[in-house]
């Protein structure tokens, strides 16, 4: 009897109520491999969630945020509120980063800004609440007579990951 | 898929200086913070540092400021950590690894390591 | 800067429940990251922000976070889960922002 359950491809289960025939999954139920003995429910995006892709017979639904959210966990098992860029989401909610620090994301937490010292450069453009300060020649390369510097084109910042 | 290759194992005398470098591929590099741990033997793991591959700005734990240099090559998509006045407490593994897209969440990948080996 | 206190070890049968904790100040005021580490082997990263599982990591393994301590708990444990633990927050108020605890051994018995 097991061998003959084996047989069912994805998208079936093997209905013991019927001899071990393959019945095809009922609506809003799938089956990703063979053998399944039953399907499972499809995943529902209601909510802050959204749905990024149906549900098939082989595959579950999966699901995304509505704007002003982002995921959190594997198959985004959760949805967090986003917050402004220059602040930092703590457990009581949105809040400006402090005096030194900046996130240029909607979502983490406020990131000290670059000490330009360390690498021997000096600051050319202050850091703000949504950016980190930019660094430019060390100061000894700023003396009289240094020719002037040229700040660095922009480039994308480093952003959001997919999930 | 994202991966992170790293130099080969070095043995640096003390008072040397050793350059680790970590390719990355599978992604785009200037995107993503990337940041160097380490692993002493029979020890913990301990933050070094980070650089934004975009801009090259760094920030260093205190123990390592004046000693230790992040850089990057955008261009071959590598990092780099050049650690100097090597002593034989900075015999370790050395990891990089890439912070996924925003500051605060956990490191997502890793490299496979690289063992320095300090000794006289 | 910032504490994280770890035991240095723990033991449990296989099946069991194993529970690593992290103690610090204030710990559920922040985010609270996991990472699972072998011999000769990059770490992993088990659990982010408190209580995410990235993809690929066993529904097994969850976390915790509040008050002072924060907790990984494995259930029905296997052998391929002995390693080491270590858990890791960001402290962008000091100038060591990135802040290990000391580890904890996962030990099965048998």
């Known amino acids: 009897l097991q061998d003959l359950c084996s047989n069912c491809p994805a998208g079936t289960f093997c209905d013991n109520n019927r001899s071990q025939i393959c019945s095809p999954c009922p609506p809003n139920s799938f089956s990703s491999a063979g053998g399944q003995r039953t399907c499972d429910i499809c995943r529902q995006c209601k909510g802050v969630f959204k749905t990024r892709k149906e549900c098939s017979s082989t595959s579950n639904a999966e699901c995304d945020c509505i704007s002003g959210y982002h995921c959190l966990g594997a198959e985004c098992s959760m949805c967090e509120q986003d917050c402004k860029q220059g602040q930092e989401l703590t457990k009581k909610g949105c809040k400006d980063c402090c005096f030194g620090t900046f996130n240029d994301q909607k979502r983490g937490i406020c990131r000290p800004w670059t000490n330009c010292s360390l690498d021997g450069k000096s600051v050319l453009v202050n850091g703000t609440k949504e950016r980190d300060v930019v660094c430019g020649p060390s100061p000894a390369d700023l003396s009289p007579g240094a020719s002037s510097a040229t700040p660095p084109a922009p480039a994308r910042e480093p952003g959001h990951s997919p999930q | 898929q994202v991966q992170l290759v790293q130099s080969g194992a070095e043995v640096k005398k003390p008072g040397a200086s050793v350059k680790v470098s970590c390719k990355a591929s599978?992604?785009?590099?200037?995107?993503?913070?990337m940041h160097w741990v380490r692993q002493a033997p029979g020890q913990g793991l301990e933050w070094m540092g980070w650089?934004?591959?975009?801009?090259?700005?760094?920030n260093y734990a205190q123990k390592f400021q004046g000693r230790v240099t992040m850089t990057r090559d955008t261009s071959i998509s590598t990092a780099y950590m050049e650690l100097s006045r090597l002593r034989s407490d900075d015999t370790a593994v050395y990891y990089c690894a890439r912070e996924p897209g925003y500051y605060g969440s956990g490191l997502d990948y890793w490299g496979q390591g690289t063992l320095v080996t300090v000794s006289s | 800067s910032y504490v994280l206190t770890q035991p240095p070890s723990v033991s449990v049968a296989p099946g069991e429940t194993a529970r690593i904790t992290c103690g610090g100040d204030?710990?559920?005021?922040?985010?609270v990251h996991w990472y699972q580490k072998k011999p000769d082997q990059a770490p992993v990263l088990v659990v982010y922000e408190d209580r995410y599982r990235p993809s690929g990591i066993p529904e097994r393994i969850s976390g915790s976070n509040s008050g002072n301590t924060a907790t990984l708990t494995l259930s029905r444990v296997e052998a391929g889960d002995e390693a080491d633990y270590y858990c890791q927050v960001w402290d962008s108020s000091s100038d060591h922002p990135g802040v290990f605890g000391g580890g904890t051994q996962l030990i099965i018995l048998g």
């Open positions: 204030d710990i559920g005021d922040k985010r």
């Open positions: 650089i934004n591959p975009n801009s090259g700005g760094t």
């Open positions: 599978g992604y785009t590099f200037t995107g993503y913070y």
